[in-house]
Interface confidence: low
Amino acid sequence: HGTELPSPPSVWFEAEFFHHILHWTPIPNQSESTCYEVALLRYGIESWNSISNCSQTLSYDLTAVTLDLYHSNGYRARVRAVDGSRHSNWTVTNTRFSVDEVTLTVGSVNLEIHNGFILGKIQLPRPKMAPANDTYESIFSHFREYEIAIRKVPGNFTFTHKKVKHENFSLLTSGEVGEFCVQVKPSVASRSNKGMWSKEECISLTRQYFTVTN
């Protein structure tokens, strides 16, 4: 009987740049032999493709089969529970998975000190799965912005600065010594994508970094 098992309550994508993960919630009272079948539909090609017949985890990395996400109309995915010969109805993602659903991140933030300035360089993400021509800056070619948050140590005063429109930024620190910690959150002004704060990068500034001019 095909509908004896309950369906997964919800199915959704969580995605970063070329890291596209499908998640679902387990069915209630699942057994040790319960697994999940995953299928994918590409908008414009109106047929479901089976991706995994029996996944025992509650997520599946769909990056390899959605590499054209940034040049397509998007995808839907569906998941159903399978237990032996029994299977549930499908649960379908309730939104289209498109470039708009991708959470923006940075690869890293590099800080260096030059004559009393902290100079920051934002490294863009370079995922191994990305095709050679699909760089972050080619896909998001315009209106890239970054919010900068700075924390001075000692002291826990965090100050979020205005957005910068370049991968390079400067922070004036003349006369000030101590540790400065910086986080960056990317956005694209013309898009609605969420951004994720980078991990904090810190740099220590001591008197030796200041040049004296007469």
């Epitope: 300035f117 100050f159 600065h161 205005k162 910068v164 370049h166 390079n168 400067s170 922070l171 004036l172």
Partner: nanobody
């Protein structure tokens, strides 16, 4: 040279409002960052709110949602609207401006909460909030 003159301070009950003004004169067209700072007795001067030449604003966590910084370029005046005032807002409030240019053309100058980022200061106006 830039001169800054604050006004609008005074005494108010907790929950009340005040609007501070800072009139700038002199070589004002070069000013990139302007901000409000405050200093309570026995404490260090701290950044309250900053505004960039393009109108971008930033606030200290302790005043977010209560204070609003703005400026009228035609009048060369900076404002700080302070609502829902608390006793801990009691301090001398200073207006500051920065006309210096840093970095290169490919660097964005950021207006920060640190006193060393500003090279012109007003004399201050006292705000006292009683409970």
């Amino acid at each position: 040279q830039v001169q800054l003159q604050e006004s609008g301070g005074g005494s108010v009950q907790a929950g009340g409002s005040l609007r501070l003004s800072c009139a700038a004169s002199g070589y004002t067209y070069s000013m990139y960052c302007m901000g409000w700072f405050r200093q309570a007795p026995g404490k260090e001067r701290e950044g309250v709110a900053q505004i960039n030449s393009d109108g971008s604003t930033s606030y200290a966590d302790s005043v977010k949602g209560r204070f609003t910084i703005s400026k009228d370029n035609a009048k060369n005046t900076l404002y700080l609207q302070m609502n829902s005032l608390k006793p801990e807002d009691t301090a001398m409030y200073y207006c500051a401006a920065d006309s210096r240019v840093y970095g290169g053309s490919w660097y964005e100058r950021l207006c920060g909460p640190y006193t060393y980022e500003y090279n012109y200061w007003g004399q201050g106006t006292q705000v006292t909030v009683s409970s």
